[in-house]
């Protein structure tokens, strides 16, 4: 005879799977904030920076209140695959002046990477479908200036700090509904 | 000096809307979310609900979903709160305080509203 | 909701003394090295005043005589050496998960 079957996989609880997402979300929430405000007192900004090739605000998608779990976190997964691909062109192409930005810069892109791959489990453990696999995105130009450099910083990090804002109200408001 | 000042007190009979508003100034209006929150005579602070001044839609506490609207005018600095169908234990003060994203902890508040419902 | 039952219900101490407020929470507010509490001054007629936020963190122009602690679901405001404008209620709430609520408060007077 084989051998014997292993435990029963245990159904995992969708309210303990989304809380240490939140955890994390609320986590990198707050190193953004502080990463945004150490770009603002090194270069102040100017009014609001903008980015074409930033993923437009998943909040103007439509009110909190209809959400539903797949639609956010899929939503939610593309966005921050965009932020983690231009937290590293910022690094590579950003120029000396961001350099000041290290490492926390660095501790950015590792946390977002590790809230990507939390995501995805949370998916796979919640029997979400799969998104399919990702078309291989256009290269980003490289900032025609260190000023660029600076207001595309400007950009990313404020539109990373509200896209995980509303990220952290859509999933809690979808935990009180489970 | 950041700042929230609301509007003034309000009388309104039973059935009736109030709409109160909270301008801020002396920071970026769209770094903070707004929250609302009641404080009934002898009852504890309830929160009723915020929105981010960025887009998308307010969230609520269930307890006033369908009664409460939250909005906010951008260019203006401004946010707002209607609340329907008003009935006697709506008497209380509303207040607006700026949220820390994703952290629901209250940093700036204004001066309060007094709502009377009264017949 | 998870509800916060702050105790005592009133306190009267002299000015100088040490004070101590206690808030607890029905569940857990914590996660992994995160406490989702926060702390309010109020006086009659005025607007709450944030204290301290994430159970332990000051607030900008808060005096360092305010301090907070605790974990899990039992938590401490503590006033190290009372000043007379420190007699007011205190609340302290919850941002766990929606909806955050406040405990029902701790009024503070001169003994």
């Known amino acids: 005879p084989g051998p014997p079957p292993g435990p029963p996989r245990v159904s995992p609880d969708p309210r303990a799977e989304l809380d240490s997402t939140v955890l994390l979300t609320r986590s990198l929430l707050a190193d953004t904030r502080q990463l945004a405000a150490q770009l603002r007192d090194k270069f102040p900004a100017d009014g609001d920076h903008n980015l074409d090739s930033l993923p437009t605000l998943a909040m103007s998608a439509g009110a909190l209140g209809a959400l539903q779990l797949p639609g956010v976190l899929t939503r939610l997964r593309a966005d921050l695959l965009s932020y983690l691909r231009h937290v590293q062109w910022l690094r590579r192409a950003g120029g000396s002046s961001l350099k000041t930005l290290e490492p926390e810069l660095g501790t950015l892109q590792a946390r977002l990477d590790r809230l990507l791959r939390r995501l995805q489990l949370l998916m796979s453990r919640l029997a979400l479908p799969q998104p399919p696999p990702d078309p291989p995105a256009p290269p980003l130009a490289p900032p025609s200036s260190a000023w660029g450099g600076i207001r595309a910083a400007h950009a990313i990090l404020g539109g990373l700090h509200l896209t995980l804002d509303w990220a952290v109200r859509g999933l809690l408001l979808l935990k009180t509904r489970l | 000096e950041v700042q929230l000042v609301q509007s003034g007190a309000e009388v309104k009979k039973p059935g009736a809307s109030v709409k109160i508003s909270c301008k801020a100034s002396?920071?970026?209006?769209?770094?903070?979310?707004m929250d609302w929150v009641k404080q009934a005579p002898g009852q504890r602070l309830e929160w009723i609900g915020d929105i981010n001044p960025h887009g998308g839609g307010p969230i609520y506490n269930q307890k006033f979903t369908g009664r409460a609207t939250l909005t906010v005018d951008k260019s203006a600095s401004t946010a707002y709160m209607e609340l329907s169908s008003l009935r006697s234990e709506d008497t209380a003060v509303y207040y607006c305080?700026?949220?820390?994203?994703?952290?629901?902890?209250?940093?700036?508040w204004g001066q309060g509203t007094t709502v009377t419902v009264s017949s | 909701d998870i509800v916060l039952t702050q105790s005592p219900a009133s306190l009267a101490l002299s000015p100088g003394e040490r004070a101590t407020l206690s808030c607890r929470a029905s569940?857990?507010?914590?996660?992994?090295?995160?406490?989702?509490i926060h702390w309010y001054q109020q006086k009659p007629g005025q607007a709450p005043r944030l204290l301290i936020y994430?159970?332990?963190n000051l607030a900008s122009g808060v005096p360092a005589r305010f301090s907070g602690s605790g974990s899990g679901t039992d938590f401490t405001l503590t006033i190290s050496s009372l000043e007379e404008e420190d007699f007011a209620t205190y609340y302290c709430q919850h941002s766990r998960d929606l909806p955050p609520t406040f405990g029902q408060g701790t009024k503070l007077e001169i003994k």
């Open positions: 994430l159970a332990s």
């Open positions: 569940k857990s507010v914590s996660t992994s090295g995160y406490s989702y």
């Open positions: 305080a700026r949220g820390e994203l994703g952290h629901w902890y209250f940093d700036v």
């Open positions: 002396g920071y970026t209006f769209t770094d903070y979310n």
